[in-house]
Interface confidence: medium
């Protein structure tokens, strides 16, 4: 076996809750027969496990083999190029893949109108791959927070940014009519995880919503 094939320039994880994807950049001048071998090391078990012998894509979903990520010391991954009998040196992820690397997301944001109040409910992610006991709220059981961006249309399109510490919130619309749009970005106050803004959800308030009396 020669090792004259160049190594993948970089290898990294991009992860959301129970969606753990390994990515790598292709070797220069790869041929149609070039593929990539992926191996995984779990901290505490110091041996590399071969996961895929020949992936022709530039990413690999490692969720199924890293289901214990949230209860472990983390992982490293490595990738090498393979072309026939030739293979490159391994390129290893340069950081430990742990719970800290997971980008926090929400499942969705639901808005409804009740007597002129806009009630917001943040739905937490419920990935199919997650074991039954590993819910978002059990893994991140304390200090969950959500930044909320509120946009009013018509209006001057400025955002109101506020932080809430619950999955439910209410908007005080002061009798205004129009469209209220909300985005949410999760965080955990005790952790350094990045958060991703949700898709914007909008709801329209018309004059009829302010005539109801309890």
């Amino acid at each position: 076996h020669g090792t004259e094939l160049p190594s993948p320039p970089s290898v990294w994880f991009e992860a959301e809750f129970f969606h753990h994807i390994l990515h790598w950049t292709p070797i220069p001048n790869q041929s149609e027969s070039t593929c990539y071998e992926v191996a995984l090391l779990r901290y505490g078990i110091e041996s590399w496990n071969s996961i895929s012998n020949c992936s022709q894509t530039l990413s690999y979903d490692l969720t199924a083999v890293t289901l214990d990520l949230y209860h472990s010391n983390g992982y490293r991954a490595r990738v090498r190029a393979v072309d026939g009998s030739r293979h490159s040196n391994w390129t290893v992820t340069n950081t430990r893949f742990s719970v800290d690397e997971v980008t926090l997301t929400v499942g969705s944001v639901n808005l409804e109108i009740h007597n002129g109040f806009i009630l917001g409910k943040i739905q937490l992610p419920r990935p199919k791959m997650a074991p039954a006991n590993d819910t978002y709220e059990s893994i991140f059981s304390h200090f969950r927070e959500y930044e909320i961006a509120i946009r009013k249309v018509p209006g001057n399109f400025t955002f109101t940014h506020k932080k809430v510490k619950h999955e439910n919130f209410s908007l005080l619309t002061s009798g205004e009519v129009g469209e209220f749009c909300v985005q949410v970005k999760p965080s955990v106050a005790s952790r350094s995880n990045k958060g991703m803004w949700s898709k914007e959800e909008c709801i329209s308030l018309t004059r009829q919503y302010f005539t109801v009396t309890n």
Partner: nanobody, 125 residues
Framework: QVQLQESGGGSIQAGGSLRLSCAAS????????MAWFRQSPGKEREPVAV????????FYPDSVKGRFTISQDNAKMTVYLQMNSLKSEDTAMYYC??????????????????WGQGTQVTVSS
């Protein structure tokens, strides 16, 4: 300027009821929202109930829904908080708050302009 004065706090056994009052110095029609917040030592001020004075529409967080009721008496310029089935975790200083119009929209303490001095509620188990 709106002055707010709370009353009705006190000590009570778990499972009991209390009714808090908040008297405003101006007619409620000059205010969009009246609310009750509470704060226990070392914690942030949290919303408990809010009423939209124009329609009487109300909103409650899940922690008190079904146990607390906010109401208004426009003639007396007063807002009430009826608290039933009190629990030890309801122990806190309770504050009345008001806002003429909020452009920050979110139901939280920063959205409210006028505040009372607070009345202490202590629930023992």
């Amino acid at each position: 300027q709106v002055q707010l004065q709370e009353s009705g706090g006190g000590s009570i056994q778990a499972g009991g009821s209390l009714r808090l009052s908040c008297a405003a110095s101006r007619y409620l029609y000059s205010i969009d929202y009246m609310a009750w917040f509470r704060q226990s030592p070392g914690k942030e001020r949290e919303p408990v109930a809010v009423i939209y004075t124009a329609s009487g529409a109300t909103f409650y967080p899940d922690s008190v829904k079904g146990r607390f009721t906010i109401s208004q008496d426009n003639a007396k310029m007063t807002v009430y908080l009826q608290m039933n089935s009190l629990k030890s975790e309801d122990t806190a200083m309770y504050y009345c708050a008001a806002v003429r119009k909020t452009d920050s929209y979110l139901f939280d303490a920063q959205s409210f302009t006028y505040w009372g001095q607070g009345t202490q509620v202590t629930v023992s188990s």
